[in-house]
Interface confidence: medium
């Protein structure tokens, strides 16, 4: 008979035979023959394979190294890798989350537009006119200047992006 040149989904071609791939969570022990099926074995503890495969070795689960600021977000299974994230106050340096860095703080004159997560850094924005930030913070937004008028006071010193306005009593001598 004509040997196959292509096999069905979840099969692979070897020695003119279409053999079944091993399912996720299992590795290949031996290829099928004309008379026997593919032999697969489950991945061991701390190992995984996430696709239909013909791999002879399972992949090791990712290690979330605490020395790099990492911790386990989701424990790996035989079919999935471990997902790492960063400790509180830190975020991943890459999509693969192989190490962490401290969240950046927004300097005075800048406020937090988006608070950092385990995978993204703090996003800062300059305080627009009418707003200020006088601290270096990873959490604080720009605050609006104090409205002296609502307190029946007058502006004694104008605000900047780093300082609030200074209010004072109205000048009673003025006609």
């Amino acid at each position: 008979p004509e040997p196959p040149t292509a096999c069905r989904e979840k099969q692979y071609l070897i020695n003119s035979q279409c053999c079944s791939l091993c399912q996720p969570g299992q590795k290949l022990v031996s290829d099928c023959t004309e008379f026997t099926e593919t032999e697969c074995l489950p991945c061991g503890e701390s190992e995984f394979l996430d696709t239909w495969n013909r791999e002879t070795h399972c992949h090791q689960h990712k290690y979330c190294d605490p020395n790099l600021g990492l911790r386990v977000q989701q424990k790996g299974t035989s079919e999935t890798d471990t997902i790492c994230t960063c400790e509180e106050g830190w975020h991943c340096t890459s999509e693969a989350c192989e190490s962490c860095v401290l969240h950046r703080s927004c300097s005075p004159g800048f406020g937090v537009k988006q608070i950092a997560t385990g995978v993204s850094d703090t996003i800062c924005e300059p305080c627009p006119v009418g707003f200020f930030s006088n601290v270096s913070s990873a959490f604080e937004k720009c605050h609006p200047w104090t409205s002296c008028e609502t307190k029946d006071l007058v502006v004694q010193q104008a605000g900047t992006n780093k300082t609030d306005v200074v209010c004072g009593p109205q000048d009673r001598l003025r006609a």
Partner: antibody, heavy 123, light 107 residues
């Protein structure tokens, strides 16, 4: 009902030839691998060879003990399996069984057997 | 070739007994192990395939187990009709090979 009936056994002189037949019924003959197995008196079973099914081109495989002397063939129109035996020796004396093969997913096995036919090779 | 060894060539048991017949392969056969029953009149029947799967029509008192190189056939409640010779056969690698057989007799 699957049925296999062998015939053609008898007494043959050393060096002689004989052909055994196996008439199959109760299943689609062309779908199955078919095999011959023998058993010398008081001894174990011995696989001799098989002939593949239609999808696999009706090709054959033989055990080393009979390769070159025995030939397996099939008449698919009549559902008959044959074993042509040449250059017969005394040690070929045995009961000869034809057997049908089971499926790949659980390993090949002989799921149905004939009643056997006896060959005696003696001068 | 893979050698199949049935160390017990004959076995005596009483009706109702639990009987175990063993079979050893010369190398790992990955559970591709079949058991056959041969009656005194020469009739051969498949009992169990792939170590533990019962062939259609075979009574449930027959069971099989094993892995690697060591396998066994168990008859849980011996009946008169079970008097026969039992052969194991490996289906892992050509040439297919059989054990020498275990003849079961009544005490």
């Amino acid at each position: 009902e699957v049925k296999l009936v062998e015939s053609g056994g008898g007494l043959v002189q050393p060096g002689g030839s004989l052909s055994l037949s196996c008439a199959a019924s109760g299943f689609t003959f062309t779908d199955y691998y078919m095999s011959w197995v023998r058993q010398p008196p008081g001894k174990a079973l011995e696989w001799l060879g098989f002939i593949r099914n239609k999808p696999n081109g009706y090709t054959t495989e033989y055990s080393a003990s009979v390769k070159g002397r025995f030939t397996i063939s099939r008449d698919n129109s009549q559902s008959i399996l044959y074993l042509q035996m040449n250059a017969l020796r005394a040690e070929d004396s045995a009961t000869y069984y034809c057997a049908r093969y089971g499926g790949k997913l659980t390993g090949f096995y002989f799921d149905y057997w004939g009643q056997g036919t006896t060959l005696t090779v003696s001068s | 070739d893979i050698q199949m060894t049935q160390t017990t060539s004959s076995l005596s048991a009483s009706l109702g007994d639990r009987v175990t017949i063993s079979c050893r392969a010369s190398q790992d056969i990955r559970k591709y192990l079949n058991w056959y029953q041969q009656k005194p009149d020469g009739t051969v029947k498949l009992l169990i395939y792939y170590t533990s799967r019962l062939h259609s029509g075979v009574p449930s008192r027959f069971s099989g187990s094993g892995s690697g190189t060591d396998y066994s056939l168990t008859i849980s409640n011996l009946e008169q009709e079970d008097i026969a010779t039992y052969f194991c056969q490996q289906g892992n690698t050509l040439p297919w090979t059989f054990g020498g057989g275990t003849k079961l007799e009544i005490k």
